[in-house]
Amino acid sequence: EEELQIIQPDKSVSVAAGESAILHCTITSLFPVGPIQWFRGAGPARVLIYNQRQGPFPRVTTVSETTKRENMDFSISISNITPADAGTYYCIKFRKGSPDTEFKSGAGTELSVRAKPS
């Protein structure tokens, strides 16, 4: 069994206000079984942005079909970006259980928001 890695290839992305931001995340193994969640910020104050198993998350869409069992791409697109969306976003794998437990995190992608072009 290959050890799971979570790859967030972009250290940072810059998006103009009003546009969509794509945050990339791929995993290298299907094990352990459990969902992927996206958060903005680290630690106890972090904010849930997307959860495979919950919803809806009106501004968030997945780039690929995350319900397919063999899917390893958990990239997301966030629409209508505002300055309040700035921060570091983490793609985190949870291990299935009662409750699910945090297993591993990507290194994070910083989202920087530029002023809307006039």
């Epitope: 940072s12 994070g108 910083e110 920087s112």
Partner: antibody, heavy 119, light 108 residues
Framework: DVQLVESGGGVVRPGESLRLSCAAS????????MNWVRQAPGEGLEWVSL????????YYADSVKGRFTISRDNSKNTLYLQMNSLRAEDTAVYYC????????????WGLGTLVTVSS | ETVLTQSPGTLSLSPGERATLNCRAS??????LAWYQEKPGQAPRLLIY???SRATGIPDRFSGSGSGTEFTLTISSLESEDFAVYYC??????????FGGGTKVEIK
């Protein structure tokens, strides 16, 4: 061989300005995010600022926000730090540091340049 | 902001002895942690990244371990050139990037 050479340090009075430079060689400068890290006398390391390879993304430590400006000239392979409204607590050795291509740790550092703010 | 606390502040050891340096994070940084060595008049040098991966050219007497909030840098047998100050740095919770306060390894 990667080389980072800082310059521009010196002695200034509180409230004055200084511009630091870091000349880079031995790698494709425009492809790497760059940082300034400082060390006050007898103290530990403190991250100051970072700039992405394109110059589009910039971050500052709260302690320097609004006073310091990081920039880069990729045609000259040079990183800059414009330091305004200097305070005594800005006295430190300022290091230029090259980031790893994947993560925000520093795989190469310069020798540093000393900035002294004193009346 | 993630605070890194290094211990001990100073380690007094003799050449040939084993050095164990600790770094504790105020919240989990997974394995996104680096170690640096600093000597007077020299540029800081990257030793370890991703908590346990040795940087290019670093001797194998240096090793890193840990994950989450507890990390260790071990120097298996101190050589004269290893007496220096060592810093940990986390690159998970950012900005800001944060460093520990340092551990000085001095000759006993």
């Amino acid at each position: 061989d990667v080389q980072l050479v800082e310059s521009g340090g010196g002695v200034v009075r509180p409230g004055e300005s200084l511009r630091l430079s870091c000349a880079a060689s031995g790698f494709t400068f425009s492809s790497y995010d760059m940082n300034w890290v400082r060390q006050a006398p007898g103290e530990g390391l403190e991250w100051v600022s970072l700039i992405s390879g394109s110059g589009e993304i910039i971050y500052y430590a709260d302690s320097v926000k609004g006073r310091f400006t990081i920039s880069r000239d990729n045609s000259k392979n040079t990183l800059y730090l414009q330091m305004n409204s200097l305070r005594a607590e800005d006295t430190a050795v300022y290091y230029c540091a090259k980031e790893n291509n994947r993560y925000r740790f520093f795989d190469y550092w310069g020798l540093g340049t000393l900035v002294t703010v004193s009346s | 902001e993630t605070v890194l606390t290094q211990s001990p502040g100073t380690l007094s050891l003799s050449p040939g002895e084993r050095a164990t340096l600790n770094c504790r994070a105020s919240q989990s940084v997974y394995t996104y942690l680096a170690w640096y060595q600093e000597k007077p008049g020299q540029a800081p040098r990257l030793l370890i990244y991703d908590a346990s991966s040795r940087a290019t050219g670093i001797p194998d007497r240096f090793s890193g371990s840990g994950s989450g909030t507890e990390f260790t840098l071990t120097i298996s047998s101190l050589e004269s050139e290893d007496f220096a100050v060592y810093y940990c740095q986390q690159y998970y919770d950012r900005p800001p990037l944060t460093f520990g306060g340092g551990t000085k390894v001095e000759i006993k």
